[in-house]
Protein backbone atom coordinates (compact mmCIF):
# COMPACT_ATOMS: atom_id res chain seq x y z
CA UNK A 1 0.00 0.00 0.00
CA UNK A 2 1.54 3.40 -0.97
CA UNK A 3 0.08 6.53 0.50
CA UNK A 4 0.88 9.82 -1.06
CA UNK A 5 0.30 13.74 0.08
CA UNK A 6 -0.06 16.53 -1.83
CA UNK A 7 2.29 19.49 -1.71
CA UNK A 8 2.58 22.78 -1.39
CA UNK A 9 -0.50 25.14 -2.21
CA UNK A 10 -3.68 24.09 -1.57
CA UNK A 11 -4.19 21.38 1.49
CA UNK A 12 -2.90 18.20 0.49
CA UNK A 13 -5.57 15.16 0.25
CA UNK A 14 -4.49 11.47 0.55
CA UNK A 15 -4.05 9.05 -2.09
CA UNK A 16 -3.69 5.57 -2.19
CA UNK A 17 -2.59 2.99 -4.48
CA UNK A 18 -2.19 -0.74 -4.49
CA UNK A 19 0.75 -2.46 -6.54
CA UNK A 20 -0.62 -4.96 -8.72
CA UNK A 21 0.35 -7.58 -11.12
CA UNK A 22 -1.49 -8.03 -15.27
CA UNK A 23 -2.16 -11.13 -17.01
CA UNK A 24 -0.96 -10.47 -20.36
CA UNK A 25 -3.85 -10.35 -23.50
CA UNK A 26 -6.38 -9.95 -20.42
CA UNK A 27 -8.13 -6.75 -18.35
CA UNK A 28 -6.02 -5.23 -15.18
CA UNK A 29 -6.94 -2.60 -12.62
CA UNK A 30 -4.33 -0.37 -11.53
CA UNK A 31 -6.24 0.39 -7.65
CA UNK A 32 -6.47 4.37 -6.32
CA UNK A 33 -8.54 5.87 -3.52
CA UNK A 34 -8.97 9.05 -2.61
CA UNK A 35 -10.77 11.73 -0.09
CA UNK A 36 -13.75 12.04 -2.16
CA UNK A 37 -15.02 15.39 -3.23
CA UNK A 38 -18.95 16.47 -3.09
CA UNK A 39 -18.81 17.82 -7.05
CA UNK A 40 -17.88 15.67 -9.85
CA UNK A 41 -17.02 18.70 -11.52
CA UNK A 42 -13.98 20.00 -9.67
CA UNK A 43 -11.74 16.12 -9.59
CA UNK A 44 -9.74 15.83 -11.95
CA UNK A 45 -7.84 12.44 -12.22
CA UNK A 46 -4.84 11.76 -13.93
CA UNK A 47 -2.52 8.43 -14.84
CA UNK A 48 1.01 8.66 -15.62
CA UNK A 49 3.37 6.40 -16.14
CA UNK A 50 7.07 6.89 -16.03
CA UNK A 51 9.09 6.70 -19.19
CA UNK A 52 5.98 7.78 -20.87
CA UNK A 53 5.73 11.69 -21.41
CA UNK A 54 2.00 11.19 -23.13
CA UNK A 55 -0.89 10.58 -20.36
CA UNK A 56 -1.71 6.66 -19.25
CA UNK A 57 -5.68 8.53 -18.77
CA UNK A 58 -7.12 11.85 -17.45
CA UNK A 59 -10.41 12.52 -16.32
CA UNK A 60 -11.96 15.82 -15.55
CA UNK A 61 -15.25 17.74 -15.71
CA UNK A 62 -17.12 14.51 -15.15
CA UNK A 63 -15.88 13.03 -18.17
CA UNK A 64 -12.52 11.46 -19.63
CA UNK A 65 -10.09 13.77 -21.67
CA UNK A 66 -7.82 12.00 -23.90
CA UNK A 67 -6.35 14.74 -26.22
CA UNK A 68 -3.15 14.19 -24.14
CA UNK A 69 -2.86 10.12 -24.30
CA UNK A 70 -0.32 8.19 -25.17
CA UNK A 71 -0.28 6.40 -28.15
CA UNK A 72 0.43 3.09 -26.33
CA UNK A 73 -2.12 3.50 -24.45
CA UNK A 74 -4.89 4.59 -27.25
CA UNK A 75 -8.70 2.48 -26.18
CA UNK A 76 -7.43 0.65 -23.59
CA UNK A 77 -7.76 2.98 -20.40
CA UNK A 78 -11.18 3.71 -18.34
CA UNK A 79 -12.03 5.22 -15.35
CA UNK A 80 -14.86 3.91 -13.36
CA UNK A 81 -16.67 7.00 -13.97
CA UNK A 82 -19.62 6.01 -11.49
CA UNK A 83 -17.50 5.31 -8.57
CA UNK A 84 -14.96 8.95 -8.97
CA UNK A 85 -17.21 10.66 -7.15
CA UNK A 86 -17.05 8.29 -3.60
CA UNK A 87 -12.97 8.50 -4.14
CA UNK A 88 -12.05 5.55 -6.64
CA UNK A 89 -9.81 6.76 -9.21
CA UNK A 90 -9.24 3.15 -10.31
CA UNK A 91 -7.88 2.56 -13.34
CA UNK A 92 -8.75 0.03 -16.12
CA UNK A 93 -6.44 -1.60 -18.28
CA UNK A 94 -7.95 -3.86 -21.64
CA UNK A 95 -5.71 -6.11 -23.26
CA UNK A 96 -2.52 -5.83 -21.03
CA UNK A 97 1.05 -6.05 -22.59
CA UNK A 98 4.38 -6.51 -21.42
CA UNK A 99 5.42 -3.52 -21.96
CA UNK A 100 2.78 -1.75 -19.19
CA UNK A 101 4.95 -2.96 -16.61
CA UNK A 102 6.19 0.05 -14.42
CA UNK A 103 5.77 2.79 -12.17
CA UNK A 104 2.80 4.55 -12.37
CA UNK A 105 1.43 7.61 -10.39
CA UNK A 106 -2.31 8.63 -9.56
CA UNK A 107 -2.53 12.04 -9.80
CA UNK A 108 -5.47 13.89 -8.09
CA UNK A 109 -6.92 17.76 -8.32
CA UNK A 110 -9.96 18.26 -5.87
CA UNK A 111 -11.38 21.15 -4.06
CA UNK A 112 -9.74 20.69 -0.84
CA UNK A 113 -6.36 19.92 -2.59
CA UNK A 114 -3.60 18.01 -4.88
CA UNK A 115 -2.25 14.73 -4.19
CA UNK A 116 -0.63 11.22 -5.60
CA UNK A 117 0.74 8.15 -5.16
CA UNK A 118 2.70 5.62 -7.45
CA UNK A 119 2.05 1.92 -7.96
CA UNK A 120 4.16 -0.94 -9.12
CA UNK A 121 2.71 -2.73 -11.98
CA UNK A 122 4.03 -5.94 -13.26
CA UNK A 123 3.00 -7.73 -15.98
CA UNK A 124 3.44 -11.76 -17.04
CA UNK A 125 1.08 -14.68 -17.75
CA UNK A 126 0.14 -16.54 -14.82
CA UNK A 127 -2.54 -19.22 -15.21
CA UNK A 128 -4.78 -21.96 -12.74
CA UNK A 129 -2.96 -25.52 -13.11
CA UNK A 130 -5.40 -28.71 -13.34
CA UNK A 131 -3.10 -31.91 -12.44
CA UNK A 132 -4.89 -34.91 -13.52
CA UNK A 133 -4.04 -38.72 -13.35
CA UNK A 134 -2.28 -39.92 -16.91
CA UNK A 135 -3.75 -43.66 -17.68
CA UNK A 136 -1.50 -43.71 -20.81
CA UNK A 137 1.78 -43.91 -19.16
CA UNK A 138 3.23 -47.30 -18.37
CA UNK A 139 3.47 -46.41 -14.86
CA UNK A 140 1.01 -44.78 -12.45
CA UNK A 141 1.97 -41.20 -13.66
CA UNK A 142 0.77 -37.33 -12.53
CA UNK A 143 0.19 -34.85 -15.06
CA UNK A 144 -0.18 -30.88 -14.24
CA UNK A 145 -0.74 -28.39 -17.20
CA UNK A 146 -1.13 -24.75 -16.87
CA UNK A 147 -1.52 -23.18 -20.27
CA UNK A 148 -0.29 -19.87 -19.83
CA UNK A 149 2.79 -18.40 -17.77
CA UNK A 150 5.30 -15.86 -18.39
CA UNK A 151 7.86 -15.23 -17.35
CA UNK A 152 9.33 -19.32 -17.20
CA UNK A 153 8.09 -20.45 -13.54
CA UNK A 154 9.60 -23.09 -11.46
CA UNK A 155 7.77 -26.06 -11.08
CA UNK A 156 7.91 -28.39 -7.83
CA UNK A 157 5.92 -31.28 -6.54
CA UNK A 158 5.17 -31.89 -3.02
CA UNK A 159 3.15 -34.67 -1.45
CA UNK A 160 1.31 -34.58 1.69
CA UNK A 161 2.85 -38.49 2.89
CA UNK A 162 6.32 -37.81 2.08
CA UNK A 163 6.49 -33.99 2.95
CA UNK A 164 10.06 -32.44 2.51
CA UNK A 165 10.74 -34.98 -0.31
CA UNK A 166 12.22 -33.91 -3.39
CA UNK A 167 10.51 -35.04 -6.39
CA UNK A 168 13.06 -33.55 -9.00
CA UNK A 169 14.48 -36.95 -10.05
CA UNK A 170 10.96 -38.38 -10.05
CA UNK A 171 9.52 -35.44 -12.85
CA UNK A 172 9.98 -33.98 -15.70
CA UNK A 173 8.98 -30.66 -16.46
CA UNK A 174 8.46 -28.97 -20.25
CA UNK A 175 7.64 -25.43 -21.48
CA UNK A 176 6.03 -25.07 -25.30
CA UNK A 177 5.64 -21.59 -26.62
CA UNK A 178 2.52 -20.88 -27.47
CA UNK A 179 1.00 -19.52 -30.55
CA UNK A 180 1.56 -15.81 -29.73
CA UNK A 181 5.03 -16.34 -28.96
CA UNK A 182 5.47 -14.64 -25.04
CA UNK A 183 3.41 -17.04 -23.17
CA UNK A 184 4.22 -20.73 -22.69
CA UNK A 185 2.36 -24.12 -21.60
CA UNK A 186 3.76 -25.60 -18.65
CA UNK A 187 3.53 -29.41 -18.39
CA UNK A 188 4.55 -31.44 -15.77
CA UNK A 189 4.68 -34.89 -15.09
CA UNK A 190 4.74 -36.75 -11.75
CA UNK A 191 6.15 -40.69 -11.67
CA UNK A 192 5.78 -43.40 -9.05
CA UNK A 193 3.13 -41.71 -7.94
CA UNK A 194 1.27 -44.02 -4.68
CA UNK A 195 -2.01 -44.40 -3.80
CA UNK A 196 -3.74 -42.56 -1.32
CA UNK A 197 -1.66 -39.39 -1.09
CA UNK A 198 -2.29 -36.02 -1.67
CA UNK A 199 0.31 -34.46 -4.42
CA UNK A 200 0.41 -30.94 -4.87
CA UNK A 201 2.27 -29.48 -8.31
CA UNK A 202 3.43 -25.80 -7.57
CA UNK A 203 3.97 -22.99 -10.09
CA UNK A 204 5.50 -20.11 -9.59
CA UNK A 205 7.26 -17.05 -11.15
CA UNK A 206 7.64 -13.27 -9.52
CA UNK A 207 4.30 -12.19 -10.04
CA UNK A 208 2.47 -15.47 -9.14
CA UNK A 209 2.05 -18.34 -7.62
CA UNK A 210 -0.02 -21.37 -8.13
CA UNK A 211 -1.21 -24.63 -6.63
CA UNK A 212 -2.98 -27.93 -8.21
CA UNK A 213 -3.84 -30.52 -5.62
CA UNK A 214 -4.79 -34.08 -6.31
CA UNK A 215 -5.93 -36.82 -3.79
CA UNK A 216 -5.87 -39.93 -5.16
CA UNK A 217 -7.66 -43.09 -3.35
CA UNK A 218 -8.74 -46.05 -4.61
CA UNK A 219 -12.77 -45.13 -4.53
CA UNK A 220 -11.79 -40.71 -6.09
CA UNK A 221 -10.13 -38.60 -7.44
CA UNK A 222 -10.18 -35.13 -5.70
CA UNK A 223 -8.76 -32.12 -7.25
CA UNK A 224 -7.98 -28.39 -6.21
CA UNK A 225 -6.25 -25.63 -7.57
CA UNK A 226 -5.55 -22.00 -6.29
CA UNK A 227 -3.57 -19.08 -7.58
CA UNK A 228 -2.00 -16.19 -5.39
CA UNK A 229 -0.64 -12.68 -7.14
CA UNK A 230 2.90 -11.93 -5.53
CA UNK A 231 3.20 -8.34 -5.22
CA UNK A 232 -0.01 -6.53 -3.83
CA UNK A 233 1.54 -4.07 -1.47
CA UNK A 234 -0.28 -1.03 -0.67
CA UNK A 235 1.19 2.24 -1.37
CA UNK B 1 8.56 31.74 -24.89
CA UNK B 2 9.18 27.61 -26.82
CA UNK B 3 12.07 27.64 -29.64
CA UNK B 4 13.76 25.20 -31.30
CA UNK B 5 16.96 26.07 -33.22
CA UNK B 6 17.92 23.72 -35.49
CA UNK B 7 21.56 23.85 -37.48
CA UNK B 8 22.66 25.16 -40.75
CA UNK B 9 21.97 23.68 -44.05
CA UNK B 10 23.90 20.86 -45.20
CA UNK B 11 25.98 19.82 -48.55
CA UNK B 12 27.26 16.24 -48.60
CA UNK B 13 28.19 13.91 -50.93
CA UNK B 14 25.94 10.41 -52.41
CA UNK B 15 27.57 7.60 -49.54
CA UNK B 16 28.29 10.00 -46.53
CA UNK B 17 26.22 10.73 -43.50
CA UNK B 18 25.16 13.83 -41.72
CA UNK B 19 24.25 14.36 -38.25
CA UNK B 20 22.25 17.32 -37.57
CA UNK B 21 20.74 19.01 -34.43
CA UNK B 22 17.80 20.79 -32.64
CA UNK B 23 18.02 22.88 -29.87
CA UNK B 24 15.32 23.23 -27.34
CA UNK B 25 14.76 26.39 -25.06
CA UNK B 26 11.71 27.91 -23.16
CA UNK B 27 10.82 24.42 -21.48
CA UNK B 28 11.70 21.39 -19.88
CA UNK B 29 13.40 19.27 -22.40
CA UNK B 30 12.46 16.07 -21.14
CA UNK B 31 8.48 16.65 -20.91
CA UNK B 32 8.02 16.19 -24.23
CA UNK B 33 8.89 13.74 -27.14
CA UNK B 34 11.14 15.46 -30.10
CA UNK B 35 9.79 14.47 -33.39
CA UNK B 36 11.60 14.41 -36.62
CA UNK B 37 9.61 15.20 -40.00
CA UNK B 38 11.01 15.01 -43.26
CA UNK B 39 9.86 17.61 -46.54
CA UNK B 40 10.78 16.66 -50.19
CA UNK B 41 10.95 19.18 -52.30
CA UNK B 42 7.39 20.74 -53.16
CA UNK B 43 6.40 17.28 -51.30
CA UNK B 44 3.89 16.89 -48.08
CA UNK B 45 5.64 15.60 -44.58
CA UNK B 46 6.95 12.56 -43.57
CA UNK B 47 6.94 11.53 -40.12
CA UNK B 48 11.23 10.16 -39.68
CA UNK B 49 10.50 8.99 -35.62
CA UNK B 50 10.44 10.36 -32.39
CA UNK B 51 12.74 10.45 -29.66
CA UNK B 52 11.95 10.64 -25.51
CA UNK B 53 14.77 12.88 -23.94
CA UNK B 54 13.86 11.80 -20.57
CA UNK B 55 15.42 8.37 -21.26
CA UNK B 56 16.73 8.19 -24.96
CA UNK B 57 14.20 5.87 -25.99
CA UNK B 58 12.97 6.27 -29.51
CA UNK B 59 10.06 5.10 -32.34
CA UNK B 60 11.08 5.07 -35.93
CA UNK B 61 8.73 4.85 -39.34
CA UNK B 62 9.47 1.83 -40.39
CA UNK B 63 10.61 3.27 -44.19
CA UNK B 64 13.19 5.06 -42.35
CA UNK B 65 14.39 2.05 -39.58
CA UNK B 66 18.09 1.94 -40.64
CA UNK B 67 18.66 5.42 -42.32
CA UNK B 68 18.10 7.58 -39.51
CA UNK B 69 19.39 7.12 -35.78
CA UNK B 70 17.60 10.11 -33.24
CA UNK B 71 19.77 10.39 -30.05
CA UNK B 72 19.56 13.44 -27.58
CA UNK B 73 21.70 15.10 -25.26
CA UNK B 74 20.00 16.52 -21.87
CA UNK B 75 22.48 18.44 -20.72
CA UNK B 76 22.84 21.05 -23.80
CA UNK B 77 18.72 20.33 -24.41
CA UNK B 78 19.49 19.53 -28.06
CA UNK B 79 18.29 16.26 -30.05
CA UNK B 80 20.22 14.98 -33.05
CA UNK B 81 19.35 13.06 -36.00
CA UNK B 82 21.92 11.08 -38.11
CA UNK B 83 21.45 10.31 -41.68
CA UNK B 84 23.23 7.84 -42.73
CA UNK B 85 24.41 6.58 -46.43
CA UNK B 86 22.93 9.38 -48.05
CA UNK B 87 21.46 9.52 -51.48
CA UNK B 88 19.86 11.84 -53.77
CA UNK B 89 16.61 10.99 -52.92
CA UNK B 90 17.67 12.18 -49.02
CA UNK B 91 17.66 15.49 -50.28
CA UNK B 92 15.06 17.18 -48.41
CA UNK B 93 14.22 19.86 -45.46
CA UNK B 94 14.19 17.84 -42.54
CA UNK B 95 12.16 20.05 -39.32
CA UNK B 96 12.01 18.82 -35.84
CA UNK B 97 9.07 19.22 -33.89
CA UNK B 98 7.38 19.17 -30.18
CA UNK B 99 5.45 16.87 -28.43
CA UNK B 100 3.18 13.33 -29.18
CA UNK B 101 0.23 13.35 -30.63
CA UNK B 102 0.19 16.83 -32.11
CA UNK B 103 3.82 18.88 -32.84
CA UNK B 104 3.07 22.25 -31.18
CA UNK B 105 6.36 24.14 -31.98
CA UNK B 106 8.67 23.10 -34.89
CA UNK B 107 11.92 24.08 -35.64
CA UNK B 108 12.83 25.96 -38.80
CA UNK B 109 14.34 23.51 -40.92
CA UNK B 110 17.69 21.89 -41.86
CA UNK B 111 18.24 22.22 -45.91
CA UNK B 112 20.06 18.55 -46.65
CA UNK B 113 21.50 18.72 -50.18
CA UNK B 114 22.70 15.30 -51.66
CA UNK B 115 24.64 15.84 -54.18
CA UNK B 116 28.21 14.59 -55.83
CA UNK C 1 0.42 2.64 -41.85
CA UNK C 2 -3.28 5.10 -41.66
CA UNK C 3 -3.19 7.04 -45.04
CA UNK C 4 -4.45 10.44 -44.85
CA UNK C 5 -5.91 12.49 -47.70
CA UNK C 6 -6.58 15.64 -48.82
CA UNK C 7 -8.49 15.83 -52.14
CA UNK C 8 -7.97 19.45 -52.93
CA UNK C 9 -4.52 20.35 -53.77
CA UNK C 10 -4.85 23.92 -54.16
CA UNK C 11 -7.79 26.17 -53.53
CA UNK C 12 -8.24 29.81 -55.01
CA UNK C 13 -10.42 32.28 -52.65
CA UNK C 14 -10.96 36.16 -52.07
CA UNK C 15 -9.91 38.28 -48.79
CA UNK C 16 -12.96 37.72 -46.32
CA UNK C 17 -14.12 34.29 -48.03
CA UNK C 18 -14.98 31.36 -45.59
CA UNK C 19 -12.71 28.12 -47.19
CA UNK C 20 -13.11 24.73 -45.77
CA UNK C 21 -10.31 22.57 -45.98
CA UNK C 22 -11.16 18.67 -45.81
CA UNK C 23 -9.17 15.71 -44.66
CA UNK C 24 -9.97 11.64 -44.87
CA UNK C 25 -8.03 9.01 -43.14
CA UNK C 26 -8.34 5.74 -44.34
CA UNK C 27 -9.55 4.20 -40.87
CA UNK C 28 -11.03 6.29 -37.42
CA UNK C 29 -8.26 8.46 -35.90
CA UNK C 30 -10.66 8.63 -33.15
CA UNK C 31 -10.44 12.80 -33.18
CA UNK C 32 -6.67 12.90 -32.88
CA UNK C 33 -6.30 15.15 -35.99
CA UNK C 34 -4.18 18.40 -36.59
CA UNK C 35 -3.77 21.22 -38.90
CA UNK C 36 -0.79 22.50 -39.92
CA UNK C 37 0.36 26.30 -41.30
CA UNK C 38 3.16 26.05 -43.66
CA UNK C 39 4.27 29.63 -44.58
CA UNK C 40 5.79 29.79 -48.39
CA UNK C 41 9.43 30.31 -46.24
CA UNK C 42 8.81 27.21 -44.96
CA UNK C 43 7.75 28.01 -41.14
CA UNK C 44 5.43 25.30 -40.13
CA UNK C 45 2.88 26.14 -37.26
CA UNK C 46 0.29 24.28 -34.88
CA UNK C 47 -3.44 25.39 -35.71
CA UNK C 48 -5.88 23.15 -34.45
CA UNK C 49 -5.18 19.60 -32.62
CA UNK C 50 -7.56 17.04 -31.27
CA UNK C 51 -10.09 18.05 -34.16
CA UNK C 52 -11.17 21.51 -32.81
CA UNK C 53 -8.75 22.69 -30.36
CA UNK C 54 -7.18 25.61 -31.20
CA UNK C 55 -3.54 26.43 -30.32
CA UNK C 56 -2.71 29.19 -28.26
CA UNK C 57 -2.08 32.15 -30.49
CA UNK C 58 -4.27 31.23 -33.10
CA UNK C 59 -6.68 33.22 -34.55
CA UNK C 60 -10.60 32.51 -33.75
CA UNK C 61 -11.16 32.44 -37.47
CA UNK C 62 -9.58 29.05 -37.92
CA UNK C 63 -11.50 25.95 -36.55
CA UNK C 64 -11.82 22.59 -36.84
CA UNK C 65 -14.48 19.73 -37.24
CA UNK C 66 -15.44 16.12 -38.18
CA UNK C 67 -15.23 12.63 -36.43
CA UNK C 68 -14.26 9.34 -37.40
CA UNK C 69 -12.29 9.16 -40.24
CA UNK C 70 -13.72 12.61 -42.11
CA UNK C 71 -12.47 15.62 -40.62
CA UNK C 72 -12.58 19.97 -41.94
CA UNK C 73 -10.54 22.70 -41.15
CA UNK C 74 -12.61 26.14 -41.79
CA UNK C 75 -11.09 29.56 -41.88
CA UNK C 76 -13.63 32.02 -41.90
CA UNK C 77 -13.19 35.17 -42.85
CA UNK C 78 -9.98 34.78 -45.02
CA UNK C 79 -7.00 37.41 -44.39
CA UNK C 80 -3.88 38.09 -46.61
CA UNK C 81 -1.80 36.36 -43.87
CA UNK C 82 -3.31 33.28 -44.78
CA UNK C 83 -1.86 32.61 -48.08
CA UNK C 84 -0.10 29.67 -47.08
CA UNK C 85 0.18 25.57 -47.68
CA UNK C 86 -2.79 23.58 -45.24
CA UNK C 87 -1.69 19.80 -43.89
CA UNK C 88 -3.68 17.60 -42.08
CA UNK C 89 -1.78 14.92 -39.28
CA UNK C 90 -2.98 11.89 -37.81
CA UNK C 91 -1.96 10.92 -34.15
CA UNK C 92 -4.00 8.10 -33.47
CA UNK C 93 -1.27 5.57 -34.04
CA UNK C 94 2.62 5.70 -34.54
CA UNK C 95 3.56 6.52 -37.72
CA UNK C 96 2.27 10.06 -37.88
CA UNK C 97 0.97 10.42 -41.23
CA UNK C 98 0.24 13.60 -42.96
CA UNK C 99 -1.97 14.81 -46.42
CA UNK C 100 -0.55 15.91 -49.06
CA UNK C 101 -1.24 19.24 -48.48
CA UNK C 102 -3.81 22.22 -49.64
CA UNK C 103 -2.22 25.43 -51.34
CA UNK C 104 -4.38 28.35 -50.63
CA UNK C 105 -4.16 31.25 -53.17
CA UNK C 106 -5.89 34.47 -53.89
CA UNK C 107 -8.21 34.80 -57.24
Known amino acids: LIIGFGISGRHSITVTTVASAGNIGEDGILSCTFEPDIKLSDIVIQWLKEGVLGLVHEFKEGKDELSEQDEMFRGRTAVFADQVIVGNASLRLKNVQLTDAGTYKCYIITSKGKGNANLEYKTGAFSMPEVNVDYNASSETLRCEAPRWFPQPTVVWASQVDQGANFSEVSNTSFELNSENVTMKVVSVLYNVTINNTYSCMIENDIAKATGDIKVTESEIKRRSHLQLLNSKAS | EVQLQQSGPELVKPGASVKMSCKAS????????MNWVRQSHGKSLEWIGRVNPSNGGTNYNQKFKGKATLTVDKSLSTAYMQLSSLTSEDSAVYYC?????????WGQGTTLTVSS | DIQMTQTTSSLSASLGDRVTISCRAS??????LNWYQQKPDGTIKLLIYYTSRLHSGVPSRFSGSGSGSDYSLTISNLEQEDIATYFCQQGNTLPWTFGGGTKLEFK
Open chain 2, 26 to 33: GYTFTDYY
Open chain 3, 27 to 32: QDISNY
Open chain 2, 97 to 105: ARRHNYADF
